[in-house]
């Protein structure tokens, strides 16, 4: 007689990541027995949805139910049909929404009314939508990449399951870029965290981890291309901005309400003599990271150090975990590998920014102009912000690994939000939580 | 001071459908959420679903999904409840009632009288 | 989905009397609960929201505690129109749920 296969007791979860640009759902996927287990967790599904992030959506909420369905059919479709009312959804929206909370409490409540509104018609456990704090998405993201790199594990492996994994216990520090902000997140040697607001203090599977983390609103590579267009064009003669952080030939109009519609821009906001400016791109790496550098107010520190805008950063520490659009854009430009140095990295950046524009359409003919435009410009925003915004060196570059996914699952900080609120990342072993469930509501 | 007006009571066959108006007055109707509320003879109150009518965006306890359709007319200031393949355990009172907060705070602060749906063969 | 669990069942008291209601979550609500009133043969009456909020028009002698996962109301001295049934409500997550309802009744 054949022997038949028991049926797997496993568990899901979903997660969808509202990000200011778009949102991803993200479905996990774990032995219900082994819950507590470091490492078991594991991502099975990436679902991206089709549009914009849901705060571009304050004008057209009713639209945010038909926004959802595709990524929703699609985790019903998944996760098999007897787990949907056990599989329990978060909604985690991030710095897009808090900007928006920023301009409107009333709007941002409207959205994420009617984004729970229409989570809640599906068969799963909807646990509800909630703006994350920075300091979360920074601790979350740290979590999720230590937890894939195994270094919560009390074992020490002799084997190693990623390229760049080093085989002792030390975490990996976590570095985020999304649209709207950016995370910098670690462990610091020994070292006080002078500023409270930026001090974490987690016990993860009987150890204890003193984690320093921020979160730099308005320094998203989207958010950051912002300001410094509005900081440039104060500065413009007339309605035309000559920009290095573009490729020779590139044209583009900007509305200049939108370019103050955000509230990243308000301290450049002026007057200006016209409605509409065209962006004209020169490509010249070495003026758009001069320019960009401009955003990164280093003159006034109140601790023994600081990473710009008066910000507590310890001295770096260890090996870092660079993701989202640190990945994507690095990933584009052929960067992400671990034998190339900074300076390399650095020429790469001044050759591809000073290419004309109509050689990259031709040689990128597949990619969106509205995205490939703007590689020059993030490419050097990530050098910048790395080098003289955290203060990595040419020597501490090579302990920046750029990574999209760890084990199959993304980098990022769903994963981390998940294990929290399913209480499976015990304090002990394998005990209590790190983050109360009552942060949640 | 917002009032709703709920349409009359109704006695219907198993397998058909029920069609109940709320009618809101002396107040926004638009931009408040409206729940419907049922209670079958002796028992609680058991939550059935909800419409922003600014939005049209409804959504509906499990139990009710596929059975039951919640519309809103701006121009009338009315709500709707449709259930369909009624059984003999949907006699109940049927109310709509405002939810007055927003994201988070769904509290009914105000109600219909109540319709009452006999299904009866 | 939150379960809210109401206890009693029934409470037996003379008017003038305390009358303390429970009302416990399956999980966190944070402070998002209302307490109804009903009568026999009337639409349910917001008393409560937020927990400790009174709703506009219902006298002191009613007030709400309690966040997380238990509530308490309490009426400080039952007026003979104080004898119904009433419910709590979970107001923060989908589905919206009530209690089983707690019926006070005259001793």
């Known amino acids: 007689t054949q022997n038949k296969a028991l049926p797997e007791n496993v568990k899901y979860g979903i997660v969808l990541d509202a990000g200011s640009s778009h949102t991803s759902l993200y479905i996990y996927k774990w032995p219900a027995e082994k819950e507590n287990d470091t490492g078991v967790v594991h991502q099975v599904e990436e679902c991206r949805v089709k549009g914009p992030g849901i705060s571009k959506f304050v004008q057209k909420v009713n639209e945010i139910g038909i926004y959802l369905t595709d990524c929703m059919e699609r985790a019903r479709e998944v996760i098999p049909r007897s787990q949907h009312q056990e599989t329990p959804v978060y909604l985690g929206a991030t710095a897009g929404m808090r900007l928006l909370r920023m301009e409107s409490e009333e709007l941002a409540d409207r959205v994420l009314d009617v984004v729970e509104r229409s989570l809640s018609n599906y068969p799963f456990d909807f646990q509800g939508a909630r703006i994350i704090t920075g300091q979360e998405e920074g601790a979350y993201g740290w979590i999720t990449i230590n937890y894939l790199l195994g270094k919560f594990s009390q074992k020490t492996r002799w084997f190693s399951i990623v390229p760049y994994e080093t085989n002792n216990q030390e975490t990996f520090g976590a570095l985020d870029l999304g649209g709207a902000s950016t995370q910098v997140t670690f462990v610091p040697q020994n070292q006080t965290i002078e500023s409270p607001d930026n001090a974490l203090q987690f016990r993860l599977y009987g150890k204890d981890y003193n984690v320093y983390t921020h979160s730099f609103l308005c320094y998203g590579k989207d958010q950051a291309l912002w300001q410094k267009l509005a900081k440039d064009i104060q500065v413009a003669s007339n309605e035309i901005l000559r920009d290095p952080c573009f490729h020779p030939g590139y044209k583009k109009v900007v509305n200049v309400s939108d370019l103050y519609k955000t509230p990243c821009t308000k301290r450049f906001e002026m007057t200006l003599p016209f409605q509409q400016f065209e962006i004209q791109g020169i490509g010249n790496y070495q003026q758009c990271h001069q320019s960009i550098l401009e955003l990164f107010n280093t003159s006034y520190c109140p601790y023994s150090q600081c990473a710009f805008n008066g910000i507590f950063l310890p001295p770096l520490q260890g090996d870092f975990g660079a993701f989202s659009a640190f990945y994507f854009v690095m990933k584009f430009l052929n960067l992400t590998s671990e034998k190339v140095s900074q300076e390399k990295v650095t020429e790469m950046m001044k050759k591809f920014c000073a290419q004309p524009w109509e050689e990259i359409k031709t040689s990128y003919a597949g990619v969106k102009e509205k995205y490939l435009s703007e590689y020059c410009f993030s490419g050097t925003y990530i050098l910048s912000l790395l080098l003289q915004g955290y203060h990595f060196t040419a020597d501490s570059w090579e302990h920046i690994h750029f990574i999209g996914k760890i084990q199959g699952s993304d980098a990022g900080w769903t994963l981390g939000y998940m294990l929290n609120l399913t209480n499976m990342i015990p304090a002990e072993q394998p005990l209590s939580t790190p983050l109360s469930h009552s942060t949640y509501v | 001071q917002v009032q709703l007006v709920q349409s009359g009571a109704e006695v219907k066959k198993p397998g058909s459908s029920v069609k109940v108006s709320c009618k809101a007055s002396?107040?926004?109707?638009?931009?408040?959420?409206i729940s419907w509320v049922r209670q079958a003879p002796g028992q609680g109150l058991e939550w059935m679903g909800s419409?922003?009518?600014?939005?049209?965006?409804?959504n509906y306890a499990q139990k009710f999904q596929g059975r039951v359709t919640i519309t809103a007319d701006e121009s009338t200031s009315t709500a709707y409840m449709e259930l369909s393949s009624l059984r003999s355990e949907d006699t109940a009172v049927y109310y709509c009632?405002?939810?007055?907060?927003?994201?988070?705070?769904?509290?009914?602060?105000?109600w219909g009288q109540g319709t009452m749906v006999t299904v009866s063969s | 989905e939150i379960v809210l669990t109401q206890s009693p069942a029934t409470l037996s008291l003379s008017p003038g009397e305390r009358a303390t209601l429970s009302c416990r979550a399956s999980?966190?609500?944070?402070?998002?609960l209302a307490w109804y009133q009903q009568k026999p043969g009337q639409a349910p009456r917001l008393l409560i929201y937020?927990?400790?909020n009174r709703a506009t028009g219902i006298p002191a002698r009613f007030s709400g505690s309690g966040s997380g996962t238990d509530f308490t109301l309490t009426i400080s001295s039952l007026e003979p129109e104080d004898f119904a049934v009433y419910y709590c409500?979970?107001?923060?997550?989908?589905?919206?749920?009530f209690g089983g309802g707690t019926k006070v009744e005259i001793k």
């Open positions: 409500q979970q107001s923060v997550f989908w589905p919206i749920t």
């Open positions: 999980q966190s609500v944070s402070s998002y």
């Open positions: 002396g107040g926004t109707f638009s931009s408040y959420a």
């Open positions: 419409i922003i009518p600014i939005f049209g965006t409804a």
């Open positions: 937020d927990a400790s």
């Open positions: 009632a405002r939810e007055s907060g927003g994201y988070r705070d769904h509290k009914l602060d105000v």
